[in-house]
Every structure is written in C-alpha cells, then in structure tokens.
C-alpha cells in the first residue's frame, strides 16, 4: 500500500507512518514503529502539556512571583498551566500581567470614582462643591456636606473639599 501523506486527528506523520500523538499531560518518549505504539510518559511535578502533542519536553508551570505582587489563582496540573493573579489590593501593570502594583488611594479632597480591580487602578475625582473627603482611601467616595438646615442648625464654619461644614445652634437673639 501507498505510504500515507496525511494522518487522522490525534496522529502525526513520521517515517511515512501515522503515529498516535501523546495525550495532554504526557510527553513523547519514542515514535511508533511498524511494530510498536508511540511511547509517552506523564509530565513531572510542576510541568504540563495542554494539547495532544509530540513534544519531548513538558513545559514548566508558570511561577507566580510574590516579589512582583503575584500569587497563585489556580494551581497547575499535568494538563494545565498555573494561573497567576495579583495580591489582594494590587493590580496588573500591563496586559501581560507579569507584575502587579499596589492600588492607589485617593488623597483628602478627592473621592473614589471607580474602585480598582485586578487589572485597573483606582480612579479618583476631585470632590465638587458641596462634597468632601478628609481621608486617604481606595474605597471612599466624596461625602456630601452635612445639611445644617435639616437639623435646625446653621452653618458656623463653611465646608471645603477636605472638611465637612460645622453646624451650630440658631441665633435666638433676633429682634
């Protein structure tokens, strides 16, 4: 019979012969022959192969370097790579996410417009007139000034973007 020019799915052509690929989680030790099947071996600890393959070496699991603010989100298996994520309170510095950086806080006078995620930093906005923030925070929005009127009080000290208004009693000595 004519030697094959193409092989079925999960096979590969070698020496004019179709050999079975190794299944995910295993690497190739030796090609098949006319008389023997393809020989495969499981990947070692901390190694993986995620496809049907003819690789002679497994890939090393990704290292989630705590030095770069990374931690393990999902431990790798013989068939899957480790998935890294940023430490709590940190976010990726780029799409590649090879390192992370601490979320920023919004300074007094600024409030959180958008809370940081694993891939984006905190977005701050200046507190507009009528609002204030007196803390440095990665979570707190600008708070509205206290309404003295609703408490039957008057403004004794005006508020700023960093301080609330100070309310005081109404002046009862009016003529």
């Amino acid at each position: 019979p004519e030697p094959p020019t193409a092989c079925r799915e999960k096979q590969y052509l070698i020496n004019s012969q179709c050999c079975s690929l190794c299944q995910p989680g295993q690497k190739l030790v030796s090609d098949c022959t006319e008389f023997t099947e393809t020989e495969c071996l499981p990947c070692g600890e901390s190694e993986f192969l995620d496809t049907w393959n003819r690789e002679t070496h497994c890939h090393q699991h990704k290292y989630c370097d705590p030095n770069l603010g990374l931690r393990v989100q999902q431990k790798g298996t013989s068939e899957t790579d480790t998935i890294c994520t940023c430490e709590e309170g940190w976010h990726c510095t780029s799409e590649a996410c090879e390192s992370c950086v601490l979320h920023r806080s919004c300074s007094p006078g600024f409030g959180v417009k958008q809370i940081a995620t694993g891939v984006s930093d905190t977005i701050c906005e200046p507190c507009p007139v009528g609002f204030f923030s007196n803390v440095s925070s990665a979570f707190e929005k600008c708070h509205p000034w206290t309404s003295c009127e609703t408490k039957d009080l008057v403004v004794q000290q005006a508020g700023t973007n960093k301080t609330d208004v100070v309310c005081g009693p109404q002046d009862r000595l009016r003529a």
Epitope: P66, N67, L68, G69, T93, S94, E95, A96, E98, S99, V101, L102, R104, S105, D121, S136
Partner: antibody, heavy 115, light 107 residues
Framework: EFQLQQSGPELVKPGASVKMSCKAS????????IQWVKKQPGQGLEWIGY????????NYNEKFKGKATLTSDKSSSTAYMELSSLTSEDSAIYFC????????WGQGTTLTVSS | DIVMTQSHKFMSTSVGDRVSITCKAS??????VAWYQQKPGQSPKLLIY???TRHTGVPDRFTGSGSGTDFTLTISNVQSEDLADYFC?????????FGAGTKLELK
C-alpha cells in the same frame, strides 16, 4: 541579565532644572513599573514615585508633586525624572528601581546643587 | 503617611554574633514590609520581602519576621561583609516609606 543604567553625575545651579535617565535592558520594559528613590548623605531613603511605562500612569509622593516629573520612552526603554526649581535640599543620590518591591536598582545619579 | 521607626541608628556586633534589627510601623501594614542592605557607594539590595520571604541569592543567615506593626531582621553568624546600613520599608500604602536606617558596625 536585567540592568538599569542611570545617567552620570550632575552639577547644577539653584533655580535650574535637571533631567536624569534610567535605561532598562534584559527584560520587557513595558511590563514593570520604574520607581525613583532619593538618598541624602547620612539620611534615610525617600520614595518619590513611580511610572508605569505601559500606560504612562504615574503615582507621586505628595511631597514631590511639583518638584519631580516622571516620564518614559518605550522606544528606548528609558525612564526619566526631571527635577525643577532646584535648591541645595535637592542635592542627593537618586536611584531608579524596577518593581514596587525593589528587585533591581540602578547605580544612582548624584545631583549636586550649588552656585 | 506611615512612619517606619528603626529605634537603633547604630548597632555594634562581632563576627559570628547574632544581631536583630527592629522596625516599628505607625499603623498596621500587615506583612507588606521589605528589608534592604546598603553599603557605601552602592545601591540598596533587597534582602527580605513580605516580611519574611528571603530574596533570591540572599544567604540564609538573614531572616525576617513580624506582622502588623513590629518587624525584625535577624542576622545569625554575622560576617564582615554584612557590615552595612539596613533599611526597612512598608509597601502597604502610598507613599511607600522607609525607616531611617540602622548601621551595623564592628565592636
């Protein structure tokens, strides 16, 4: 091998500005932040801020806002720090370092402000 | 800003001794603390991060411990090449802040 190569020493007059550089090699420049740290003789270290070369986002220590400006150039894998309105208090060694936890540091740029 | 206080500006030791350098944070920083060694004319060198993790290539005579507000860098079996300045740093919140440093010198 990862390396951060900083520009040479600077002697400048009070009131002037200076721009120092930090050239990165041996890694993908845009995947890691570059932070800057000030060291005055006989004193501790002071964190100035960082730049993320991927997004050009900066984060400054309030104390250095208006004093330091951080920029970067992806094409040359170089981070820059410009210091303005210089006084004798700005005389120090300035270090650039990769990552928030300073894994790799430049050799430092000595700035002397003197008339 | 979080203040990192290194109570000893200088510490005297002898080769072979065990020495502990302390650092106190003005508020809880969890374990977000690093220790650096700096020798004259050199840039700082990372020794410990996340309070107790030894950086690659750092000899195991350097040990970090602590969490919250109290942190310690211990050098067991001090060698002459360990004579240097040691700085703690918090990276729990911005701005990152350093201790004033502890200079390790020979008795």
């Amino acid at each position: 091998e990862f390396q951060l190569q900083q520009s040479g020493p600077e002697l400048v007059k009070p009131g002037a500005s200076v721009k120092m550089s930090c050239k990165a090699s041996g890694y993908t420049f845009t995947n890691y932040i570059i932070q800057w740290v000030k060291k005055q003789p006989g004193q501790g270290l002071e964190w100035i801020g960082y730049i993320n070369p991927y997004s050009s986002e900066t984060n400054y220590n309030e104390k250095f806002k208006g004093k330091a400006t951080l920029t970067s150039d992806k094409s040359s894998s170089t981070a820059y720090m410009e210091l303005s309105s210089l006084t004798s208090e700005d005389s120090a060694i300035y270090f650039c370092a990769r990552d928030l936890i300073g894994n790799y540091w430049g050799q430092g740029t000595t700035l002397t402000v003197s008339s | 800003d979080i203040v990192m206080t290194q109570s000893h500006k200088f510490m005297s030791t002898s080769v072979g001794d065990r020495v502990s350098i302390t650092c106190k944070a003005s508020q809880d920083v969890g374990t977000a603390v690093a220790w650096y060694q700096q020798k004259p004319g050199q840039s700082p060198k990372l020794l410990i991060y996340w309070a107790s993790t030894r950086h690659t290539g750092v000899p195991d005579r350097f040990t970090g411990s602590g969490s919250g507000t109290d942190f310690t860098l211990t050098i067991s079996n001090v060698q002459s090449e360990d004579l240097a300045d040691y700085f703690c740093q918090q990276y729990s919140s911005y701005p990152l802040t350093f201790g004033a440093g502890t200079k390790l010198e020979l008795k």
